[in-house]
């Protein structure tokens, strides 16, 4: 498909006078951060983006790769690099103690420096690294955590919380002896470790005592609380603030979204992950969407500012199942919510960045003809006389022989939402990718996200663009009409 | 392995404020360009961009990923829309088209608007696009092109050609009835579309009559002249310049680079394409960093300024076969091009940009640890209870079963220059990927890359930065000193 | 409380056509998989098709067996799932399920049934 | 498409038995299998999903596991109104039921 505007090199030479023209214009602010918000997409390497922006692109009925995403619009880009001290390719928790606090740490710890060793409670205390979330309330700003995984899981974790194990999700999945010496499950984190204003996303039945059914699945024994200290970390939060609400459906989240009277919102809308948005049921989950605006709603009321997580958090779910349908329907969801994030907020005052803490050996390959489906066939067959998807991963749980050969796959079937793109190596869950990934940045200070940087740089330049700890003394003017 | 400095977050809090500190220092110069330089690693997408790093820190004696490639120095990124206007996933030809004539075009295709159709000769004329180095020549300047393929391969011959097959190299390679229509073979393009002052890589064959023996391997015929017309290309493009050069080998570069009486170079030290760096005679075949060291030489004589095309050209074409190996060994030769040229020039009056044309179904996954070798295993076995790599295709040669199943594979196999790794589709050849790819850069107006472009944006923000066509009018400053 | 009630099953000649509905309630009927089982006297469990929901393009599936013969549709608007079978065989004789998925472990596993409808093809 | 291979196809046991009845799948189903329980003239009932996950209301003397091809489904102690016959369920690609196990009390 060749459009036929685009055969006339006036075309290319107008949209990139245009855009000349426009980076021309660009004006680093020099002014601080009122607001910050950081968009994770876990999982989302550069094969993602452009993947995901096809898509999009495609369900506007439009060619696909000529459109924009929300982030792609942001003026500036880098490059992060993303190994932690342990290893070439990392995992989310690790990733996220860098980017959230600024220092690298091990695979599979979250908020400790790489002194920590993974699932060795002794080695916690002393090497925690505290967040750029937990400045931010220090500096009297509102804080939220949003994400489409359990609030409990790698990625917002490293926003509150310090543990050698990424998975002590309960203290159900935390050993007796780690419990001993003092370990504390991330839940039980979450609400103790500082005061979060907005909580919102899945992992309800890690902060109820064990046999409290689910009130959305209680025919569901494996849905129900998990928790043996017999606690209801719901109730305690709920106490702990006057104007404190606690929900679980979208109902009740959009309710007290508007509610002047709540001050503190914790929305767990599942038991574990939230559903993936192609499964989710619209009357009682909230969308990602929906939950960043609920948060935002809540959060822009403080004059100090605020700062806002939100993960899109099973882009990385459904690379890992090597069913690219999910992954990339997720990818949408999330630049979904960093467009909404956009209408609500101003880049005059609010610095906003998009990253992901890792990739995935996902590519997109085969020459496919502009405008056809990205998961559809490659043209021609392989070597094997077999069709083959553009979509494949390196390893992952799609490799499957069939009477000792490689399946042959119709264009019905890898446009099925539930298709299995083929990998090289068979593995029980296909894995991340080291190679660098993007970072995109808008307001104040976002000039400084540039060339290629570590990991750590993201949660500095946050720091740095709001005046936090440790540069206090960051000789940024305040923004004209800011309120303290 | 765990580097002791690392387990302290002063490492990480300290080198973070270092690099915020770089960033701050960050000024935007008001001044055109006088030099300009595009490095064009072929296939070079970000997944190889950060395997290389590696590689090549290890070559160091480091762990790896905490090094500095000489590309990643450069403080500006953007990412760039690869896509042809036909394809989602682009070839060299029409991806030449883009960041080099700043249109594009369609696959296949080069110098060429998207009004051009594929092996359609008649559909040539009237639709040729001009390159920035045209455009550069025509404005005073000198200008070269430098690579590792043969000089008449897709991504240099989008400097200066127009044809509808990427694969016309010499008249033989040319149909009789496109001959007779009036299309020009690359080879004929090379010598006469423009005056190129240096051109340096492979592809003797092509300049030469049909029987006339390569120097350099004159007992084998298929190394020879290919020329059907009978015509010596190099014999009339010697015949242009009063002080112009022919060289073929590296000793007669190095000479002809350091005579002040050369004014025109053209080194062509292999029949089709260079060797793998790998493979490379360090006697008679020159490196990329000294073709480019030569280049510069010769070219930085000219007071107008210069522009230059570089090109690691067979990082590509290691992938195509996949084997990382040479992909990345390749990879590093360019790297070390880039960073000669830093060293060779001023980047107060050059504008030096890198980026991929593509990039390639090529991951790096698997959980290594960190220190381990790029070519080595990942930790523990695949679901068949096989070892596998931790770099990965998704598609390509590497694909074979043995006795109806995966291949094991030990670390010394996948470590030998010649392992293929394994992928998910067999193919002849491994395809290239669609996802976008960085560009990084330095320089005056290096500023003006940024944020996600179309990778047509390159070529014009080449033009802009040195008052080319169509932006003479470009209202810069020239640098202080520069002559005309 | 979720909800499946199927009806249009009865005696039915072969080669002719018969079509299902199952009604549904208790439940976004957008925003769920809805497929259709049968079971032959005697014998065991067999799925024939499956429709998706508004997110992911109500795309459809259908075991080989019926393919070609049987189609699945939904009515948004009632929330009624159907299907519509033709060319019947005497061995199409069996007890019809519909039935609603829950993605529990992101699994589209089948967590409500209806109570069945009988279809006898015979002359 | 995925075809699954229950075994046995009828079991007679006596009440507190362990009754084990296993599926093998012909390829990887990622632990997407659910277990059922039909009495004459019902509709199936799920009784695990996942593998292992036990819907609530059922006892816990039934149990699964398993991973890749294999998986078992497990009734600790065989009680009179576990009288049904039991279908192993592929959700990995689409739907397979298993060929069904009638289960006896002897």
């Known amino acids: 498909i060749i459009p036929v505007e685009e055969e006339n090199p006036d075309f290319w030479n107008r949209q990139a006078a245009e855009a000349l023209g426009a980076a021309k214009k660009l004006q680093p602010a020099q002014t601080a951060a009122k607001n910050l918000i950081i968009f994770l997409g876990d999982g989302m390497g550069v094969s993602t983006v452009t993947a995901a922006r096809i898509l999009k692109g495609q369900k506007k009925d439009k060619l696909g790769p000529e459109t924009f995403l929300a982030m792609d619009r942001f003026p500036y880009v880098a490059l992060s690099k993303t190994y932690s001290v342990d290893k070439h390719v990392p995992d989310s928790g690790a990733t996220a103690t860098a980017y959230l606090c600024g220092v690298k740490g091990n695979f599979q710890t979250i908020g400790l420096s790489a002194a920590a060793r993974f699932n060795q409670c002794n080695t916690t205390r002393g090497n925690e690294v505290i967040s750029v979330m937990n400045r931010a309330k220090k500096a009297g700003k509102s804080v939220g955590v949003v994400t489409t995984t359990r609030v409990q899981h790698a990625s917002p974790a490293g926003a509150y919380a310090h543990t050698v194990n990424r998975n002590w999700y309960s203290d159900a999945d935390v050993p007796a002896s780690a419990r001993q010496e003092g370990c504390q499950d991330i839940a039980t984190q979450l609400i103790s470790n500082m005061d979060i204003d907005v909580i919102l996303g899945g992992g309800r039945k890690y902060m109820f005592p064990m046999g409290t059914p689910d009130p959305e699945y209680p025919d569901d024994y494996s849905q129900g609380g998990t928790r043996l200290d017999g606690k209801n970390l719901v109730q305690e939060w709920l106490a702990k603030h006057q104007g404190a609400r606690y929900v679980w459906n979208r109902t009740e989240l959009l309710q007290a979204s508007l509610d002047p009277s709540v001050t503190h919102l914790m929305g767990l809308f599942e038991p574990g992950d939230m559903k993936y948005e192609i499964h989710r049921d619209s009357t009682l989950d909230p969308s990602l969407m929906e939950m960043t605006e609920a948060a935002l709603l809540l959060l822009s009321r403080n004059p100090r500012g605020f700062f806002l997580f939100v993960e899109g958090g099973r882009i990385d779910h459904g690379h890992h199942e090597s069913r690219a349908y999910r992954a990339l329907t997720e990818t949408i969801m999330f630049d979904d919510a960093i467009e909404r994030a956009g209408q609500l907020t101003s880049e005059e005052d609010t610095l906003s960045l998009v990253t992901a803490d890792h990739s995935h050996v996902f590519s997109f390959g085969g020459y496919p003809l502009r405008g056809s489906s990205i998961f559809g066939l490659a043209p021609g067959k392989a070597r094997d006389r077999k069709a083959y998807t553009v979509l494949l991963y390196g390893n992952g749980p799609g490799y499957v022989l069939k009477d000792g050969a490689r399946p042959d796959v119709t264009e019905s079937e890898s446009g099925s939402p539930e298709y299995r793109q083929q990998s090289a190596v068979p593995l029980d869950g296909e894995t991340h990718a080291g190679e660098d990934v993007a970072v995109f940045a808008r307001g104040p200070q976002a000039h400084l996200v540039h060339g290629v940087q570590e990991q750590t740089f993201i949660a500095h330049v946050m720091a740095f663009a709001a005046c936090l700890e440790p540069y206090t003394a960051c000789d940024l003017a305040p923004r004209a009409g800011t309120t303290d | 392995i765990i580097p002791v400095e690392e387990e302290n977050p002063d490492f990480w809090n300290r080198q973070a404020a270092e690099a915020l500190g770089a960033a701050k220092k960050l000024q935007p110069a008001q001044t055109a360009a006088k030099n300009l330089i595009i490095f064009l690693g072929d296939g070079m997408g970000v997944s190889t961009v950060t395997a290389a790093r590696i590689l090549k820190g290890q070559k160091k004696d480091k762990l790896g990923p905490e090094t500095f490639l000489a590309m990643d120095r450069f403080p500006y990124v953007a990412l760039s829309k690869t896509y042809s206007v036909d394809k989602h996933v682009p070839d060299s030809g029409a991806t030449a088209t883009a960041y080099l004539c700043g249109v594009k075009g369609n696959f296949q295709t080069i110098g060429l608007s998207a009004a051009a159709r594929f092996n359609q000769c008649n559909t040539t004329r009237g639709n040729e696009v001009i390159s920035v180095m045209n455009r550069a020549k025509k404005a005073g300047k000198s200008v070269g092109v430098v690579t590792t393929t043969r000089v008449q391969h897709a991504s240099p011959a989008g400097a200066y050609a127009h044809t509808v097959n990427r694969n016309w190299y010499s008249d033989a390679d040319v149909p009789a009835s496109a001959r007779q229509e009036g299309c020009q073979d690359i080879a004929t393009q090379l010598i006469s579309n423009m005056d190129i002052d240096v051109i340096l890589g492979g592809g003797r064959k092509y300049m030469f009559p049909m029987g006339t023996p390569d120097p350099e391997y004159p007992d084998d015929y298929s190394q020879g002249g290919t020329r059907l017309d009978g015509k010596n290309l190099v014999q009339e493009w010697l015949a242009k310049h009063q002080g112009a050069r022919y060289v073929w080998n590296r000793t007669e570069l190095l000479q002809a680079s350091l005579d002040p009486s050369v004014t025109h170079l053209m080194g062509l030290f292999e029949p089709g394409d260079m060797k793998y760096e790998i493979h490379r005679d360090s006697t008679l075949d020159p490196s990329l960093m000294e073709m480019t060291e030569a280049a510069l030489l010769l070219l930085s004589r000219n007071p107008r300024g210069f522009f230059l095309f570089v090109e690691g050209g067979r990082i590509d074409h290691g992938h195509h076969e996949s084997r990382a190996y040479r992909a990345l060994t390749e990879t590093i030769m360019f790297d070390d091009a880039i960073e000669r040229a830093g060293q060779l020039t001023s980047e107060e009056d050059t504008l030096s940009l890198v980026t991929a044309d593509h990039s390639h179904v090529f991951s790096f996954g698997g959980y290594p640890l960190r220190g381990s070798s790029i070519f080595g295993l990942a930790p523990g076995k695949a679901r068949d209870r096989k070892a596998y790599t931790v770099l990965l295709y998704g598609n390509g040669p590497g694909y074979v079963l043995k006795d109806g199943a995966r291949p094991d594979v030990t670390e010394s196999e996948s470590g030998s220059p010649e392992y293929r790794q394994q992928s998910a589709v067999p193919l002849d050849g491994e395809t290239h990927a669609g996802e976008d790819v960085a560009v990084f850069a330095r320089g005056p107006q290096a500023h003006l890359v940024h944020g996600v472009q179309e990778q047509t944006f390159i070529a014009h923000v080449m033009a802009f930065a040195a008052c080319l066509e169509p932006y003479t009018a470009c209202d810069l400053a020239p640098r202080a000193g520069t002559t005309d | 409380e979720v909800q499946l009630v199927e009806s249009g099953g009865g005696l039915v000649q072969p080669g002719r056509s018969l079509r299902l509905s199952c009604t549904a309630s208790g439940f976004t009927f957008t925003d769920y998989y809805m497929s259709w089982f049968r079971q032959a006297p005697g014998k065991g469990l067999e799925w024939l098709a499956l429709i998706r929901n508004k997110a992911t393009g109500y795309t459809t599936e259908y075991s080989a067996s019926v393919k070609g013969r049987f189609t699945i549709s939904r009515d948004n608007s009632k929330s009624i799932l159907y299907l519509q079978m033709n060319s019947l065989k005497t061995e199409d004789t069996a007890v019809y399920y519909c039935a609603r998925a829950s993605f529990y472990y992101d699994g589209k596993v089948l967590a409500y049934w209806g109570q069945g409808t009988l279809v006898t093809v015979s002359s | 498409d995925t075809q699954m291979t229950q075994s046995p196809s009828s079991l007679s046991a006596s009440v507190g038995d362990r009754v084990t009845i296993t599926c093998q799948a012909s390829?990887?189903?990622?632990?997407?299998i659910a277990w059922y329980q039909q009495k004459p003239g019902k509709a199936p009932k799920l009784l695990i999903h996942?593998?292992?996950s036990l819907q609530s209301g059922v006892p816990s003397r039934f149990s699964g596991s398993g991973s890749g091809r294999d998986y078992t489904f497990t009734i600790s102690s065989l009680q009179p109104e576990d009288i049904a016959t039991y279908y192993c369920?592929?959700?990995?690609?689409?739907?397979?039921f298993g060929q069904g196990t009638k289960l006896e009390i002897k």
């Open positions: 996942y593998t292992s």
């Open positions: 390829q990887d189903i990622n632990k997407y």
């Open positions: 369920l592929q959700y990995d690609n689409l739907y397979t």
